[in-house]
Amino acid sequence: EEELQVIQPDKSVLVAAGETATLRCTATSLIPVGPIQWFRGAGPGRELIYNQKEGHFPRVTTVSDLTKRNNMDFSIRIGNITPADAGTYYCVKFRKGSPDDVEFKSGAGTELSVRAKPSAPVVSGPAARATPQHTVSFTCESHGFSPRDITLKWFKNGNELSDFQTNVDPVGESVSYSIHSTAKVVLTREDVHSQVICEVAHVTLQGDPLRGTANLSETIRVPPTLEVTQQPVRAENQVNVTCQVRKFYPQRLQLTWLENGNVSRTETASTVTENKDGTYNWMSWLLVNVSAHRDDVKLTCQVEHDGQPAVSKSHDLKVSAHPKEQGSNTAAENTGSNERNIY
């Protein structure tokens, strides 16, 4: 009779998280008599997974009936596998002894690798808004996947981005891994409707990658452009001056009219019109009573957009010594405007 061999035919098995792992082990002989034990790892720190003789192992079931007299199959199934179960499992035959059984022979081991899906990627943008032509950073994170190999791509409106850095942690062996990527995106005035997408591909996803998105509407600030114009005279001694506030985003905007540097009226943008690109337009007007002024009037439209420093545009209104000629003396003069564009 040849000496007993412990055969673990599968050197390495790959199981998806949540599934059941089958670890095969057979002996080539019934002699010597003694139980089988399964361990994860080798050496003194090894972890007992199953003991044929005693103990309670709720996640482990045997493939065959170990109580049968001539049984030589000691394969086990481990249910509800998680990444923490990864490792090398050894089937070890013990010889009956007194008082304790003695380790007789071990199988070559079966390495259990666990496939775990990455979590849905979470994309986060900068804490503060930025204006067009500025570069902003977006981060993408996904966790809990195994094995370590993973592919991450960035897109802006379907176009793949190339300026990004990605790290997979930890660097060494681990039960599961995390990925962190930072992409740089240059904002343009047309980006209110734009999206940044982080796409993660992993062997567990069977060709159907996970995506996380961020809307640039939460990141971008498009400063308004201002235009002050004087409208035709509405009444003999009244002039209508309008301030066109164009192409701004977000909507939060406060406008102040100044007459010769004194606050005349303050209002908040309410009934705005939306442009195709997602930016807004708004118009405010001021009715100036010319007869109340002896000298020329400097009218200033001052706009505070989204908590930023005010921008303004001024208009000089000529007050004639002869009110009846007012209609012919309405030429406006724009002075020192301070304007910026943001999308």
Epitope: V13, T28, S29, S75, A108, E111
Partner: antibody
Framework: QVQLQQPRAELVKPGASVMLSCKAS????????IHWVRQGPGQGLEWIGL????????DCSETFKNKATLTVDTSSSTAYMQLSSLASEDSAVYYC????????????WGQGTLVTVSA | DVVMTQTPLTLSVTIGQPASISCKSS???????????LNWLLQRPGQSPKRLIY???KLDSGVPDRFTGSGSGTDFTLKISRVEAEDLGVYYC?????????FGGGTKLEIK
């Protein structure tokens, strides 16, 4: 010495089933895993599955899970593979092979059975 | 499953000349015990496969020493120092590290 005997050929009609046999001798049949391998005409080798004669513990590759059923008869030291719902693309040579201890795997092969599926 | 890729598909060699077959695996075949479970098989025309080499480089008994196996990780090579007429057939690499076992597509050795 270790021997695995297989019938030379089987002719089967489409849609039918066939039971292929692999009779082992020269070793303790119940001690070692038996594997089944397929080779299509002019093709390479493809692993089908394995069975342990002592327990009937079996597993098949995903490709053959609904096609092949592995069984053993320890009294005659014979392993069987039933192939069901046969189609012309199942025409191939089917081999049995024995696993041994430690590194002694795919050493011992049967001669193979040529299965021809034809009306 | 681990994919085994063999090159070339066909090898035409003059008797007495050397031959070399490459086998690449899609994953490392190195197992945790430090061993690499890669075999080379030869299937002569009309016969069942026969194992020539196991554990990358160990020759089975009765296999002539003109056969040598080498490699590690994912890249493996079978070399025949001087091809003889009895060497013709199809050579397969097969891995036993990962479940399920997978074979290379085969390399047909022809005699010129």
């Amino acid at each position: 010495q270790v021997q695995l005997q297989q019938p030379r050929a089987e002719l089967v009609k489409p849609g039918a089933s066939v039971m292929l046999s692999c009779k082992a001798s020269g070793y303790t049949f119940s001690s070692y895993w038996i594997h089944w391998v397929r080779q299509g005409p002019g093709q390479g080798l493809e692993w089908i599955g394995l069975i342990h004669p002592n327990s009937g513990n079996t597993d098949c590759s995903e490709t053959f899970k609904n096609k092949a059923t592995l069984t053993v008869d320890t009294s005659s030291s014979t392993a069987y593979m039933q192939l069901s719902s046969l189609a012309s693309e199942d025409s191939a040579v089917y081999y049995c092979a024995r696993d041994g201890a430690s590194y002694d795997w795919f050493v011992h092969w049967g001669q193979g059975t040529l299965v021809t599926v034809s009306a | 499953d681990v994919v085994m890729t063999q090159t070339p598909l066909t090898l035409s060699v003059t008797i007495g000349q050397p031959a070399s077959i490459s086998c690449k695996s899609s994953q490392s075949l190195l197992y945790t015990n430090g061993k690499t479970y890669l075999n080379w098989l030869l299937q002569r025309p009309g016969q069942s496969p026969k194992r020539l080499i196991y554990l990358v480089s160990k020759l089975d008994s009765g296999v002539p020493d003109r056969f040598t196996g080498s490699g590690s990780g994912t890249d493996f090579t079978l070399k025949i120092s001087r091809v003889e007429a009895e060497d013709l057939g199809v050579y397969y690499c097969v891995q036993g590290t990962h479940f399920p076992r997978t074979f290379g597509g085969g390399t047909k050795l022809e005699i010129k």
